[in-house]
């Protein structure tokens, strides 16, 4: 009778996470008697996966019917595979012994690799908004994938970006991996409607990449432009001055009118007009009773946008019974001291 051989026909098996893995093993003889055991890994630290003789192994089923009397097939199936199950599995024949069974012969081993899908990419932008012409960073993260090979691309409005850096961790062997990428994006005034996309391709995705998105509207702040003008009025003792606040984003805006440096009225922008590029416009007006003023008046439109330092523009309103000409406007940062009439 030829000596028993342990045959593991497959050097490697690849299984998708969540599926069952079948590990094949056959004996060439029924003799010598003794249990078949399956281990993950070799040496002293090996992990028992299945023992034919005894024990409870809820995830393991035998491929061949256990009650076959001449069974030489000791293949097993492991259910609900996770990346943690990856490793080399050995089918080991033990010879009956006293008091303990003795390892007799081992199969060559079957390497189980687990294909695990990456998690949905999560894209996050900068913590604070930036203005056009500045560069902001977006990060993309995905976890839990295996094998390690993965491709990540960045797009802005469908155009591929090149300024990014990507790391896959850990660098060595692991049951699963994570990817982290940072892209640098230069903001433009038209980016309120723009979107950045992080696209991940992996063998488990079968050509259908995962995408994570972020809107640049969360990252951009477009400061407003101000224009103060006087509108014609029928009544000679009244002047109508308007402040046109244009092309700002986001919405949050507070406007204060000052007459010769003194606060006349404060209002919060409510009914805004949205432009095609996603920015907003707003207009505020101020009625000035010219009779109440002997001298010329400097009217200042002061705007605080998105919690930033206020910007303002002033308009010199000439008080003259016969003259209705408009004064020049002046732009200032922050609060303005009263402006002398032009």
């Amino acid at each position: 009778e030829d000596e028993l051989q342990v045959i593991q026909p497959e050097k490697s098996v690849s299984v998708a996470a969540g599926e069952s893995a079948t590990l094949r093993c056959a004996m060439t003889s029924l003799i010598p008697v003794g249990p078949i055991m399956w281990f993950r890994g070799a040496g002293a630290g090996r992990e028992l996966i299945y023992n034919q003789k005894e024990g409870h192994f809820p995830r393991v089923t035998t491929v061949s019917e256990l009650t076959k009397r001449n069974n030489l097939d000791f293949s097993i199936s492991i259910s609900n595979i996770t990346p943690a199950d990856a490793g080399t599995y050995y089918c080991v024949k033990f010879r009956k012994g006293s008091p303990d069974d003795v390892e007799f012969k081992s199969g060559a081993g079957t390497e189980l690799s687990v294909r695990a899908k990456p998690s949905a990419p999560v894209v996050s932008g900068p913590a604070v908004r930036a203005t056009p012409e500045h560069t902001v960073s977006f990060t993309c993260e995905s976890h839990g994938f295996s094998p390690r090979d993965i491709t990540l691309k960045w797009f802005k409005n469908g155009n591929e970006l090149s300024d990014f850096q990507t790391n896959v961790d850990p660098a060595g062997d692991s049951v699963s991996y994570s990817i982290h990428s940072t892209a640098r994006v230069v903001l433009t005034r038209g980016d309120v409607h723009s979107q950045v996309i992080c696209e991940i391709a992996h063998i488990t995705l079968q050509g259908d990449p995962l995408r994570g998105t972020a809107n640049l509207s969360e990252a951009i702040r477009v400061p407003p432009t101000l224009e103060v003008t006087q509108q014609p009025m029928r009544a000679e003792n009244q002047a109508n001055v308007t402040c046109q606040v244009s092309n700002f984003y986001p919405r949050g805006l507070q406007l204060t009118w000052l007459e010769n440096g003194n606060v006349s009225r404060t209002e919060t922008a409510s009914t805004l007009i949205e432009n095609k590029d996603g920015t907003y416009n707003w207009m505020s007006w101020l009625l000035v009773n010219t009779c109440a003023h002997r001298d010329d008046v400097v009217l200042t439109c002061q705007v605080e946008h998105d919690g930033q330092q206020a910007v303002s523009k002033s308009y010199a309103l000439e008080i003259s019974a016969h003259q209705k000409e408009h004064g020049s406007d002046i732009t200032h940062e922050a609060a303005l001291a009263p402006t002398a009439p032009l």
Epitope: L30, I31, P32, V33, P35, Q52, K53, E54, E65, L66, T67, K68, R69, N70, R95, K96, S98
Partner: antibody
């Protein structure tokens, strides 16, 4: 309590047929292989045939191969042995025996036996 | 085909130790089982996997198996142990029995 109860034995002429039954109770019948073992008068035990728990695998001693057929009905927890072309040397008490499990099982339970006599 | 050989008979005095042997080629590489059969009764399993006793079998029954020989040992033999004993190789598709040994308690 495990119980195995054979029936169907009797006197039959050479060349005739008999069907033995073994009604099982007290265990999950489909989880165990079952066997027929016979014992001729004044002689030792002779294994005849075995069947796996599902019924998918059957085994026979050379002395009965081609003449006997083992089968089981797991829904009825019953084991059968169809014996055709009976010969005088098939005369014996036929025991139904349960395998003890999946790891080198002995016969851990036996029925009381049913006598088959083949004689003209 | 595989064959197992047993002595036809063994005699022992009450209280003494009885040993029944079972020989087969490299039997030590296989598992041996032993059955006890009293007259007019069905066989009863007394030893399996060489040395193990099923529940209900007295401790005086023990087994060993190495080389070409398996041995059933009954220590402190009692009159009720008088019976036929059969060895079996519990490892293959065909269950091979020995010819049986009649144990007489004198």
């Amino acid at each position: 309590e495990v119980q195995l109860l054979e029936s169907g034995g009797g006197l039959v002429q050479p060349g005739g047929s008999l069907r033995l039954s073994c009604a099982a109770s007290g265990f999950t019948f489909s989880s165990y292989a079952m066997s027929w073992v016979r014992q001729a008068p004044g002689k030792g035990l002779e294994w005849v045939s075995a069947i796996s728990g599902s019924g998918g695998d059957t085994y026979y001693a050379d002395s009965v191969k081609g003449r006997f057929t083992i089968s089981r009905d797991n829904s009825k927890s019953t084991l059968y042995l169809q014996m055709n072309s009976l010969r005088a040397e098939d005369t014996a008490v036929y025991y139904c025996a349960k395998d003890g499990g999946s790891y080198y099982p002995p016969f851990d339970y036996w029925g009381q036996g049913t006598l088959v006599t083949v004689s003209s | 085909s595989y064959e197992l050989t047993q002595p036809p008979s063994v005699s022992v005095s009450p209280g003494q130790t009885a040993s029944i042997t079972c020989s087969g080629d490299k039997l030590g590489d296989r598992y041996a089982c032993w059955y006890q059969q009293k007259p007019g009764q069905s066989p009863v399993l007394v030893i399996y996997q060489d040395t193990k006793r099923p529940s209900g079998i007295p401790e005086r029954f023990s087994g060993s198996n190495s080389g070409n020989t398996a041995t059933l040992t009954i220590s402190g033999t009692q009159a009720m142990d008088e019976a036929d004993y059969y060895c079996q190789a519990c490892d293959s598709s065909t269950a091979v029995f020995g010819g049986g040994t009649k144990l007489t308690v004198l």
